[in-house]
């Protein structure tokens, strides 16, 4: 049931639930936005990012896209709707528990994405092989 | 209406565990609809937010009381429940369990009466 | 986490007076504000929510209004049962954090 001030003051179409009939509650995500970052050659990273911070939308995931160019290394940490793309790419991953790192085509770049859709999921990046979702492990969690 | 009842000691020693139970009526702990959460007011200052906990078992604890925090529930008795572990003076509070509509994620919308813990030997 | 500073501590008015209270975040806090009322020996009582609406059987006289780090809540008409400590409380940022409260006395 939705409380009567929530009935009027929210629209319809703001109302988020998942496939049990359930309410989806806002999510919280590290968001910095982009940040220097020292992540390189390691298989996972610690985002580094201060601000959790709660989505707009109940349907936003976190994502995280990790840069190298010639002069420096960003980790940017933000909510966003993965319906829409983001730097163009679409989130793929996002039902995901864990924010798995994917190499995407970027010229002059380096350029990494993953999203997930668990508390603070992106504040920890994982770049390692053993997590991609060739394993059927992960496989399951994500799609249980 | 939902309607929410703290319960457990009112005194409680330096070092020992706080322990209290939120008892809820007029709707159910495992609805989607809502979460649930604990905060405590120490005598004549402000309120502070310890953590909370949505239906799908995801909780969320204040940072600076995170290693010392377990928010738990009983879906068969309707009720959760709070221990914090280590106790000092300054834990000493008004401590309210309360509930808010889940899309308004932080909002609280249903408070109990709230109970007196002191932290003494 | 973002600190929340309320003014002015105290609001000395009569009934029938409007009251401003002011409420103003150390950081945007995007319109993720909300505003409580507490009563001595009583628990709070959400007045407003994301800076604007009125919670279930709250009167017309309270209104909320700003957004990013300057937020007021406005009592149109003080009534007798409107003196009490007003907390402000934002959910941007987590943990939620809250003001340090005003109170609204009688002058």
């Known amino acids: 049931t939705i409380p009567p001030h929530v009935q009027k003051s929210v629209n319809n179409d703001m109302i988020v639930t998942d496939n049990n009939g359930a309410v989806k509650f806002p999510q919280l995500c590290k968001f910095c936005d982009v940040r220097f970052s020292t992540c390189d050659n390691q298989k996972s990273c610690m985002s580094n990012c201060s601000i959790t911070s709660i989505c707009e939308k109940p349907q936003e995931v976190c994502v995280a896209v990790w840069r190298k160019n010639d002069e420096n290394i960003t980790l940017e940490t933000v909510c966003h709707d993965p319906k829409l793309p983001y730097h163009d790419f679409i989130l793929e991953d996002a039902a995901s528990p864990k924010c798995i790192m994917k190499e995407k085509k970027k010229p002059g770049e380096t350029f990494f994405m993953c999203s997930c859709s668990s508390d603070e999921c992106n504040d920890n990046i994982i770049f390692s092989e053993e997590y991609n979702t060739s394993n059927p492990d992960l496989l399951l969690v994500i799609f249980q | 209406q939902l309607q929410l009842q703290e319960s457990g000691p009112g005194l409680v020693k330096p070092s020992e565990t706080l322990s209290l139970t939120c008892t809820v009526s007029?709707?159910?702990?495992?609805?989607?609809?809502?979460?649930w959460g604990w905060i405590r007011q120490p005598p004549g200052k402000g309120l502070e937010w310890i953590g909370s906990?949505?239906?799908?078992?995801?909780?969320y604890y204040s940072p600076s009381l995170k290693s010392r925090i377990i928010i738990s529930e009983d879906t068969s008795k309707n009720q959760f429940s709070l221990k914090l572990s280590s106790v000092t003076a300054a834990d000493t509070a008004v401590y309210y369990c309360?509930?808010?509509?889940?899309?308004?994620?932080?909002?609280?919308?249903?408070w109990g009466q709230g109970t007196l813990v002191t932290v003494s030997s | 986490e973002i600190v929340l500073t309320q003014s002015p501590a105290t609001l000395s008015l009569s009934p029938g007076e409007r009251a401003t209270l002011s409420c103003r975040a150390s950081?945007?806090?995007?319109?993720?504000l909300a505003w409580y009322q507490q009563k001595p020996g009583q628990a709070p009582r959400l007045l407003i929510y994301?800076?604007?609406n009125r919670a279930t059987g709250i009167p017309a006289r309270f209104s909320g209004s700003g957004s990013g780090t300057d937020f007021t809540l406005t009592i149109s008409s003080l009534e007798p049962e409107d003196f009490a400590v007003y907390y402000c409380?934002?959910?941007?940022?987590?943990?939620?954090?809250f003001g340090q409260g005003t109170k609204v006395e009688i002058k």
């Open positions: 309360a509930s808010g509509f889940t899309m308004i994620r932080g909002a609280l919308d249903y």
């Open positions: 007029g709707g159910s702990i495992s609805s989607s609809s809502y979460s």
């Open positions: 906990f949505y239906y799908s078992g995801i909780t």
């Open positions: 950081q945007s806090v995007r319109s993720f």
């Open positions: 994301d800076a604007s």
């Open positions: 409380q934002q959910r941007s940022n987590w943990p939620p954090t």
